[in-house]
Amino acid sequence: KFSKQSWGLENEALIVRCPRQGKPSYTVDWYYSQTNKSIPTQERNRVFASGQLLKFLPAAVADSGIYTCIVRSPTFNRTGYANVTIYKKQSDCNVPDYLMYSTVSGSEKNSKIYCPTIDLYNWTAPLEWFKNCQALQGSRYRAHKSFLVIDNVMTEDAGDYTCKFIHNENGANYSVTATRSFTVKDEQGFSLFPVIGAPAQNEIKEVEIGKNANLTCSACFGKGTQFLAAVLWQLNGTKITDFGEPRIQQEEGQNQSFSNGLACLDMVLRIADVKEEDLLLQYDCLALNLHGLRRHTVRLSRKNPIDHHS
């Protein structure tokens, strides 16, 4: 619950908020978990802590790792973890799944697409918006505040939207980009590129050694009856049936659940008697249909002891 996944691109600014909240008067200490080394607060450092925020200005691939924040008040300490992954910039236009923020959906009226994580940054309007890497042009599109407004939304407006803005820190400018998928609600049945609702991309699932654990892969594929749609789990890139571990089995959940009219599928991965070696595996939730395949990766971690009051 108090671990948060954050990601960014090398040479861009990345600002991460401590997953534990506290009043502005509380002090927050940040550490690099692997070395327990304190993160400096001096702004001359490329990576520095500023209260609840951890700033990478700019980020480097080597910054990837788990960072610990401790919120200190006069009566208690609260600990949180930020799992940071910095990726190399892609040379092509395609934005991989692991760089995508949550999907938003719009109706045929006007719709807003908010720029993800922008609240953490010191940015200046206007934002730049791109759809499938093309700069948006035309009177139907308007950048306003931290969102894009699309008037008279059409099914063709579905796609991946990227916002680009400049973060200013003490007079220095850093670029930031963020991408999310936009889907269009339609009264008629339709099919779209799979959208995985759970698990979240790069989710860390806490489990107890010796206990049973369940992972649910849930994805939606459009509206109405789908010609071809499937969800499944893979272990280290191998189908469950081929992996050969009888303790780990998958079974279908709800076959076609029409929540909000969407056609969705669930697949539950059941791990009996969780073992230490299970923590080393990569668990992939795969959703596929005629449009293509989407993959979300989960890793298991040993459940941390509950935070103690100081």
Epitope: K112, I113, R142, K145, F147
Partner: antibody, heavy 117, light 111 residues
Framework: SVEESGGRLVTPGTPLTLTCTVS????????MSWVRQAPGKGLEWIGY?????NTYYASWAKGRFTISKTSTTVDLKITSPTTEDTATYFC???????????????WGPGTLVTVSS | AAVLTQTPSPVSAAVGGTVTISCQSS????????LAWYQQKPGQPPKILIY???TLASGVPSRFEGSGSGTQFTLTISDVQCDDAATYYC???????????FGGGTEVVVK
């Protein structure tokens, strides 16, 4: 500051225009909203006009209200008032450069509209 | 349009105590945090307390704290004062169309 005016007693069906006069800031930098409150009831969002002059209305308010502006005023026209439109009407300023659309930092005192035959 | 459901009124609190008001949305607010809290006293316009779900508005005492994300939000008032007696409203902004929606309001009575 912002201040509403134009509230009065009108008969059903008689169009009425309320005016919000602003000072100390520019309407080209801020979105402005209209909110109303019937006697003894909760707040109800009517719509807003953005700094770029685009207008948006609550689903229930479309066709019943029109929002427009000049350089220092924002008008709310109630096209065909009914008794259900009896309320105090507030004009509110959206925070500058705020990322969202839900935060209004300056409100007028309100103007009372009574619709009765 | 979305519906925001608040803690039913009235909520009683003792001076020096803590009061919690919840606000539940029928759909996720924009960016999971486009929600603000307002305080209104009789005969006065509303006053902003919290915006972006958890950011304290300028001049508002730190006794007021906002938390939550997505569809579930909470306003907590600690060390309640007599002056906190008022009606509190949440207001959400949404991705889908331009509707903003107020919650029904929660009256706080201070004893």
């Amino acid at each position: 500051s912002v201040e509403e005016s134009g509230g009065r007693l009108v008969t059903p069906g008689t169009p009425l225009t309320l005016t919000c006069t602003v000072s100390g800031f520019s309407l080209s930098s801020h979105d402005m909203s209209w909110v109303r409150q019937a006697p003894g009831k909760g707040l109800e969002w009517i719509g807003y006009i953005w700094s770029d002059d685009n207008t948006y209305y609550a689903s229930w308010a479309k066709g019943r209200f029109t929002i427009s502006k000049t350089s220092t005023t924002v008008d709310l026209k109630i096209t065909s008032p009914t008794t259900e439109d009896t309320a105090t009407y507030f004009c509110a300023r959206d925070q500058y450069r705020s990322s969202g659309v839900s935060d209004y930092d300056i409100w007028g005192p309100g103007t009372l509209v009574t619709v009765s035959s | 349009a979305a519906v925001l459901t608040q803690t039913p009124s009235p909520v009683s609190a003792a001076v020096g105590g803590t009061v919690t008001i919840s606000c539940q949305s029928s759909q996720s607010v924009g960016n999971n945090n486009d929600l603000a809290w307002y305080q209104q006293k009789p005969g006065q316009p509303p006053k902003i307390l919290i915006y972006k779900a958890s950011t304290l508005a300028s001049g508002v005492p730190s006794r007021f704290e906002g938390s939550g994300s997505g569809t579930q939000f909470t306003l907590t008032i600690s060390d309640v004062q007599c002056d906190d007696a008022a009606t509190y409203y949440c207001l959400g902004g949404y991705d889908d169309d331009a509707d903003n929606t107020f919650g029904g309001g929660t009256e706080v009575v201070v004893k």
